[in-house]
């Protein structure tokens, strides 16, 4: 197979014919050293998936349900290119499956039993697979046949295409369950009409259905969406209140050696030459031979799927949960409203050891999952492999953009017993230098810098945000002569100062000796000119408070703070000499797990929190000898957020604005994936 050939998989004669035409037309417009198309014909999409996994083909376009099959072992395929719909300016690559109800009704998602339901059709994504998959564990047993369980769950339904003889209740609202537009309640508009007419109490449709059927906002305002957290929202708020986000049509490839760059190069060129309204001779998004061949006729173009986005992230936790429930038919033994153990995400093996000790002491109420970077942990929480972790504000922002929510805040200053209910203002992000140096905020260019990690608040977002507004470019590695900013590109000058050891050099976890607040300060002590840390870092690591060899003889008066006005002050005066106020670290979780996590953590801190005085013979949640493992060591308690329960509210407008501005300099692959 030529190096630059993409073997496209076709599933019918008509698709094969279009594929050959695609191949010939691409050959005519691309240079001889550019990508080329070869066509492989298989009997079905599943056969195509297997062929790609076996390296007999390279690419095929699939619906969401098949993307799930493609991701399962042993196939292990991943999404590489997405079709988009709508305009180039506002491309839609996903739709949202929603549960619509009338505003004057008063039930929530967990009160659907005994209601009347309207569905688009049996086996369809938004109308059946997703809602029934998510409700699966609430259905009465036996859950097979599924139609019977659903019939016994709702008090009456319209499920077009269902068997009305065997399951008459499923056709109660539309006699015969007609499987075409002859049934007035068929498909999206029909299911919505079923609700509108008062036949049903809830309609399972797409987010756009309401807008397509009700042009008038006043009419739309008579309806609401049911959210999975048992609240309701307006129909405009579908991004924050849906059953699942469903990818429309996606090109998949192998996860390893999958030619994704080549596939993108090919499709990008293809849309330039043969996309919507581009060419008379060949059209990528239509065909005289049939409908939706190779690509959907309704597609307007392609978007490259960010490399960090695997199939789990692409399909989303809710969609995968729904499909897995339907396919595997398994439900937890415990009732779904009971808190299962909370899986904490630990960074590298040091945090894992502390987490394991916590797990043992919690009698298994806490379980542990590990990842090598904070972003990998956030991804694991998103896809359900983990449930929670405590994050610096910079990562609370990324987690929030990825759909996670803050649950509890770390408090550092409020003594018990008021701590749990107190909202602290935050801590100070400061720039620390040696007293013996002549550095000021205005002459840092060309100096050696020490950072907690890329993407963290005090160590990166605040100082680099301020720097960006001064230098107006993102080449921070050129501004400083060298430095240690864990998480930077390994060949960057901002990894030059890091200590490692070797395979972990510049890694954003505790295996890198200069990682985190204490690590950045150590970097200043041993090699650097300036360290960007929290205001408590110097006091916490001097005067013998840190027993490690490098720190035990350090004196607080040997260090000073840089003020933004060009002056310097004692480390005792952070309130008058800081870069900005930083939001406290916070615990994040998926929305569906937030209440569980909060309840369990409040209980855990009563047993293992700062009320424990002897940490040498008892487990202490907020202690790890200055290493800030799992939580900051100076945490007094985890505090309730009250109404600050979204990442925007928690971080505050000013900080969100600062981080959003820095996004043009972002090196976060996860953030890129979550904002796709």
């Amino acid at each position: 197979v030529p190096e630059k050939s993409v073997r496209w998989c076709a599933v019918s004669e008509h698709e094969a014919t279009k594929c050959q035409s695609f191949r010939d037309h691409m050959k005519s417009v691309l240079p001889s050293n550019g990508p080329s198309v070869a066509c492989v014909k298989k009997a079905s999409h599943l056969d195509c998936i297997r062929a790609i996994a076996a390296n007999e083909a390279d690419a095929v376009t699939l619906d969401a349900g098949l993307v799930y099959d493609a991701y399962l072992a042993p196939n292990n395929l991943k999404p590489v290119v997405a079709e988009f719909y709508g305009s180039k300016e506002d491309p839609q690559t996903f739709y949202y499956a929603v549960a619509v109800v009338k505003k004057d009704s008063d039930f929530q998602m967990n009160q659907l039993r005994g209601r009347k339901s309207c569905h688009t059709g049996l086996g369809r994504s938004a109308g059946w697979n997703i809602p029934i998959g998510l409700l699966y564990c609430d259905l009465p047993e036996p859950r097979k046949p599924l139609e019977k369980a659903v019939a016994n769950f709702f008090s009456g339904s319209c499920v077009p295409c269902a068997d009305g003889t065997d399951f008459p209740q499923l056709c109660q609202l539309c006699p015969g369950c007609g499987c075409s537009t002859l049934n007035q309640y068929f498909s999206y508009s029909g299911a919505f009409k079923c609700l509108k007419d008062g036949a049903g109490d809830v309609a399972f449709v797409k987010h756009s259905t309401i807008f397509e059927n009700l042009a008038n906002k006043a009419d739309r305002d008579q309806y609401e969406l049911l959210c999975l957290d048992n609240t309701r929202k307006s129909v405009d708020e579908y991004k924050d209140c849906h059953l699942a986000r469903v990818p429309s049509h996606t090109v998949v490839a192998r996860s390893v050696g999958g030619k994704e760059d080549l596939i993108w190069e090919l499709l990008n060129q293809a849309q330039e030459h043969f996309g919507k309204d581009k060419s008379k001779e060949f059209q990528l998004f239509s065909s005289p031979h049939g409908k939706d061949l190779l690509f959907k006729d309704s597609a307007h173009g392609f978007l490259k799927v960010p490399p960090r986005m695997d199939a789990k992230m692409y399909l989303g936790y809710e969609y995968i949960t729904a499909i897995r429930n339907l396919r595997e038919g398994t439900c937890p033994e415990a009732p779904t409203d009971e808190c299962k153990p909370v899986k904490w995400c630990a960074l590298s093996h040091h945090e894992r050891l502390k987490c394991d000790e916590w797990s043992v002491n919690s009698a298994g109420k806490i379980e542990c999952e590990s990842a090598e970077t904070t972003e990998d942990c956030i991804a694991k929480i998103m896809n359900g492999e983990a449930d929670a972790m405590s994050l610096d504000g910079g990562f609370v922002y990324i987690a929030g953009m990825c759909g996670l929510v803050p649950v509890l805040a770390e408090n550092y200053n409020t003594p018990n017993p008021n701590c749990e209910n107190t909202a602290e203002e935050g801590y100070f992000a400061v720039a620390v230098v040696k007293s013996s140096s002549d550095l000021t905020w205005d002459n840092l260019k060309g100096k050696k810098s020490c950072h907690t990690a890329v993407g963290r608040t005090a160590g990166w977002n605040i100082p680099m945000g301020l720097l960006y507004s001064k230098i107006n470019h993102c080449r921070f590695d050129e501004f400083f002569s060298e430095g240690c900013a864990p998480g930077s590109e390994k060949n960057s000058s901002l990894c030059k100062l890091c200590m490692g050891p070797s395979p972990n050099l510049c890694e954003p976890n505790n295996k890198e000796g200069y990682y985190g607040y204490t690590g950045a300060f150590r970097c200043l002590v041993e090699k650097g000119d300036v360290a960007f840390v929290k205001h408590q870092t110097v006091p916490q690591n001097t005067g013998g408070k840190n027993p490690d060899a490098w720190a035990k003889n350090l004196k607080e008066e040997d260090y000073e703070l840089l003020c933004l006005d060009g002056s310097r002050k004692s480390v005792q005066e952070p309130a008058n000499c800081h870069l900005a106020r930083a939001p406290n670290h916070a615990v994040v979780a998926r929305k569906d797990k937030a209440d569980c996590v909060q309840t369990l953590l409040l209980d855990q801190q009563r047993m293992f929190g700062s009320s424990v005085t002897d940490c040498s013979s008892n487990f202490c949640l907020f202690e790890s000898k200055t290493k800030d493992l799992l939580f900051r060591d100076d945490t007094v308690c985890l505090a309730k957020l009250h109404d600050r329960n979204t990442y925007e509210k928690y971080l505050g407008e000013e900080y969100v604005k600062a981080v959003t501005n820095l996004r043009k300099c972002s090196t976060s692959p996860l953030l890129e994936a979550c904002t796709f």
Epitope: H350, L353, K354, D356, V360, N361, S617, N618, F619, K625
Partner: nanobody
Framework: QVQLVESGGGSVQPGGSLRLSCAAS????????MAWYRQSPGKQRELVAG???????NYADSVKGRFTISRDNAKNTVYLQMNSLKPEDTAVYYC???????????WGQGTQVTVSS
């Protein structure tokens, strides 16, 4: 310097039993949570069972009902009684005392357990 010495490993047939011991000696008395870990080739070290200072225990799902952890504080020793052994229990077993810190590598040599017919 603290030393943790594991013993009691060996080869056994599926369904058989073994009792592992771990003695802590040196400058720090064992006063905190202790645990048994295991590591098989190419896999991460995983927590098998733990026991708090007060004697509360916790087990990995894969060994629940088959393994029992216990301790003798006077002897600074922790035990792992392993019954109904399976081939997938084959690994090197290590013990740790969490009071030694999460950073210093205080792992002992470990003791090999092999389960095969």
């Amino acid at each position: 310097q603290v030393q943790l010495v594991e013993s009691g490993g060996g080869s056994v047939q599926p369904g058989g039993s073994l009792r592992l011991s771990c003695a802590a000696s040196g400058s720090i008395a064992s006063i905190n949570t202790m645990a048994w870990y295991r590591q098989s080739p190419g896999k991460q070290r995983e927590l098998v069972a733990g026991i708090t200072r007060g004697g509360s225990t916790n087990y990995a799902d894969s060994v629940k009902g088959r393994f029992t952890i216990s301790r003798d504080n006077a002897k600074n020793t922790v035990y792992l009684q392993m019954n109904s052994l399976k081939p997938e229990d084959t690994a090197v077993y290590y013990c740790t005392d969490y009071s030694l810190g999460y950073y210093q590598d205080y792992w002992g040599q470990g003791t090999q357990v092999t389960v095969s017919s």
